[in-house]
């Protein structure tokens, strides 16, 4: 039986490419200068297939000597992108991913952008700004989030299976009403996890069961009406 009886989908996906950034405008820079410099490292969850902009500490570009972005991705050598103001030159070392670029010319904007974030962009990104007043750092632990594909079906007598396939991190599955449930997790080499919850309802007045999937990218619910037990007699009149 299809999800939610007659194709009723419980969440409408928006596939427009979203953009996320932790950058601040200049007003915030002046207000939060000292606070930001103290907060060196940030954990940052970003949805897969969106665009991400990572920012350096809010230092006026006129005070700069060198800007360096250091990028450490799992299973790859450290990549560095550097800009030297005095000679107006940029240099890259071990950087192979063409989706990770300066937002614009580094003499105008020190921010780094990732176009269409992929699972492989999970990692640590650090901006180091060398100035006459010292070195200023800002680091990001970028956690790429992958929305799981959710399915719900009935496989045998009053038993339903809800799957949250290839999510990152693992999704959490709950049911309305609660049943006799077993949950399994399957880990994939790309870092995603499939969660499968199988539930049985012995109580015969349970009509519709709802699988609720909680995930950092958003929650989703699907429901189905349980099929009659094969061979069930018609209700006594």
């Amino acid at each position: 039986q299809p999800n939610n009886s007659l194709m009723l989908q419980t969440s409408k996906e928006n596939h427009a490419l979203a953009s996320s950034s932790l950058c601040m405008d200049e007003k915030q820079i002046t207000q939060n200068y000292s606070k930001v410099l103290a907060e060196v490292n940030t954990s940052w969850p970003v949805k897969m297939a969106t665009n991400a902009v990572l920012c350096c500490p809010p230092i006026a570009l006129r005070n700069l000597i060198i800007i360096t972005w250091e990028i450490i991705l799992r299973g790859q050598p450290s990549c560095t992108k550097a800009y030297k103001k005095e000679t107006n030159e940029t240099k890259e070392t071990n950087c192979t991913d063409e989706r990770i670029t300066w937002v614009s010319r580094p003499d105008q904007n020190s921010d780094l952008q990732i176009r269409t974030v992929a699972i492989t962009h999970d990692g640590y990104y650090r901006c180091i700004m060398v100035t006459p007043d010292g070195n200023f750092h800002r680091g990001y632990h970028l956690q790429v989030l992958v929305t799981p594909e959710v399915t719900l079906f009935q496989n045998r007598n009053r038993t339903a299976v809800c799957k949250a396939v290839a999510g990152k991190p693992a999704a959490h599955i709950s049911w309305i009403p609660e049943g006799d449930c077993a949950t399994k997790q399957e880990y994939w080499s790309n870092g995603t996890v499939t969660v499968k919850s199988t539930c049985h309802w012995e109580v015969h007045n349970v009509s519709t069961v709802t699988c609720h999937v909680s995930h950092l990218t958003g929650n989703k619910s699907l429901y189905i009406e349980l099929l009659p037990v094969p061979g069930a007699k018609k209700s006594a009149k």
Epitope: Q1, P2, N4, S5, L6, L8, T10, I176, P177, E178, N205, V206, S207, T208, V209, T210, S221, Y223, I224, E225, L227, P228, P230, A232, K233, K234, S235
Partner: antibody, heavy 114, light 107 residues
Amino acid sequence: QVQLQQPGSELVRPGASVKLSCKASGYTFTSYWMHWVKQRPGQGLEWIGNIYPGSGTTNYDEKFKSKATLTVDTSSSTAYMQISSLTSEDSAVYYCTTGTSTYWGQGTLVTVSA
Amino acid sequence: DVQMIQSPSSLSASLGDIVTMTCQASQGTSINLNWFQQKPGKAPKLLIYGAVNLEDGVPSRFSGSRYGTDFTLTVSSLEDEDMATYFCLQHTYLPWTFGGGTKLEIK
């Protein structure tokens, strides 16, 4: 698209029976429960029962067990509800609904009058 | 049976107002719920399914929320066409049960 077609009205005598129809289209009729709902004039909604066309399995609210009988004709994708021993209390609009209440027929007004 | 207690039974509000109505499941039962709008002489129309999800084609001024066994339907900016009766339905357990309805009138 999913459609549930019901006749507009039925005029019946007290004590008689009436068989209401609900013709389904736009989906696999045998794969989804069909529910029937009663609404008396100016009143709320009451669930009567449901039927699974794939097997003929039925469930009834206790209140309607001796009043309503649900059947289907899968060849014409039509659900039926027979209401027996009609009284003025049975004068109401009767709806069929499927897809966990997503889709509704327009309702049949049953008037019980001598 | 799961009883659905709906309140208020009637409500009068002005155009542009925010209005809310609630349904509560008896005995603290864990259920799923749909909200409907019904106009005189018409079949109920599904607005919200699964307590919080907006049905296709329904204006975004309608929203649903849940807190435990309490469910709320909110209309964020009342329009003339919203004058109708609103029902909730729990479809988790048989028999399905409806709230008594909230009749919404425009001042």
